[in-house]
């Protein structure tokens, strides 16, 4: 009669929790039985983020630190079931903690928009397109951002119109701009729960152009045309 190692009740274990659960929340549990009927002690291995603890007797797993889905989900740790007494044989399974996203990242520009320019003087109103993103997960649909000007004083000179859930168009309202840089503030709302808003700045230069590029004295880079 050979002593056998404990047997987990499942192949692996999974649990879904919101990433903003309070520290100390029970996030899951594992169970195993010993073929000889010995008591079992549970432990965790590979908890590299230090997020979890396990009750050695019950197999209940609790959070001991703030969880963050953006650090990677599912979070996978090994669970070990060891006989108490006897030969102390052990078995290993896995516990996967699936972190459900909470809207906790404000929108931002998807790339670096330095170098935007219009050739001065404008012969007609101009426009440019920009893209927004955030670091939240958007299950079942893409992000649905809404866009508006960041301050009322900008509305005489600029207007912003939504193209789709991630892109918008910034247009001039007239052609009477000075030959200088304008910083246009854009308010981006993600429509999430709770809604988060980001205010981003688009620097737009009105400059004399040579062959379609912003003319700069020697030592300055040429800007690329964006409208």
């Amino acid at each position: 009669d050979v002593n056998e190692a404990p047997q987990f009740s499942q192949h692996v274990f999974q649990a879904k929790v919101s990433e903003d659960v309070a520290i100390g929340t029970k996030v899951g549990n594992v169970t195993a039985k010993d073929p000889e009927g010995l008591d079992i002690s549970y432990s965790l291995r590979g908890d590299t983020r230090g997020w979890l603890k396990i009750d050695h007797v019950t197999g209940e797993i609790f959070s001991v630190a703030p969880l963050d889905r953006e650090a990677g989900s599912p979070y996978r740790v090994q669970v070990v079931a060891t006989e108490v007494g006897g030969s102390s044989l052990s078995s290993v399974s896995e516990f996967h903690l699936i972190l459900m996203d909470v809207n906790d990242n404000p929108p931002r520009l998807a790339k670096d928009y330095t170098g935007l320019f219009f050739c001065h003087p404008l012969s007609a109103p101009g426009s440019l397109i920009f893209e927004a993103t955030d670091d939240d997960q958007h299950l079942f649909r893409g992000p649905h951002f809404t866009f508006s000007l960041g301050s009322g004083s900008l509305q005489n000179d600029w207007e912003v119109s939504k193209i789709n859930g991630t892109h918008a168009r910034l247009s001039t309202r007239h052609t009477e701009f000075e030959e200088r840089e304008y910083v246009v503030l854009i308010r981006i709302n993600d429509g999430g729960r709770p809604p988060l808003e980001g205010i981003v700045s688009l620097p737009v230069t009105f400059c004399s152009c040579v062959e379609g590029s912003c003319f700069r004295p020697a030592g300055h880079k040429h800007h690329h045309h964006h409208h």
Epitope: S9, Q10, V12, Q14, V92, E94
Partner: antibody, heavy 116, light 107 residues
Amino acid sequence: QVQLVQSGAEVKKPGASVKVSCKASGYSFSSYWMHWMRQAPGQGQEWMGYINPSTDYTEYNQKFKDRVTMTRDTSTSTVYMELSSLRSEDTAVYYCARSRLGFDYWGQGTLVTVSS
Amino acid sequence: DIQMTQSPSSLSASVGDRVTITCRASENIDSYLAWYQHKPGKAPKLLLYAATVLESGVPSRFSGSGSGTDYTLTISSLQPEDFARYYCQHYYRTPLTFGQGTKLEIK
């Protein structure tokens, strides 16, 4: 990036054995269990078993228990699946796959043909 | 062993259509379910796990639902690259088993 590269196609006679290899790269080899599946022509996927590379623990589908052996070589990050006493119905594409919740990375498959 | 019964076995649809594939387990698998897409000559691709969670990099037109024994894969608006075979698979306990697959063809 994660890659699982399997050995090439094999033609075997009934009663022989075949050993298919699966070389892992792009991740910590010992940290993920490796499973083996097969798909016979016109059939669905069939799970054969898995090996835990860190402990060498194996668990096999009862259907193959007496004929399959899974091993690993941690020095080369390679797992092996050997199937013995081959018969014509073992003709299939054999896959290794990395375990997560489901199988997130698969090898390209190895066709094993059993024919007299 | 837990049996996985998938339906339909084949399905014809057009680009832009909404498509639903169902998978029934012979006993409660508590959302320990994955869905795969498989194209000829290629390795299967994980689409969803835990019944509803989209694998990283998978388009959001794919979604999953269900609990207990009954599960559904939905493609909200078919794209040309979606025509393939789809499998469900449980990982609740060994032996792990797959559905027989649903072949999604162009109408």
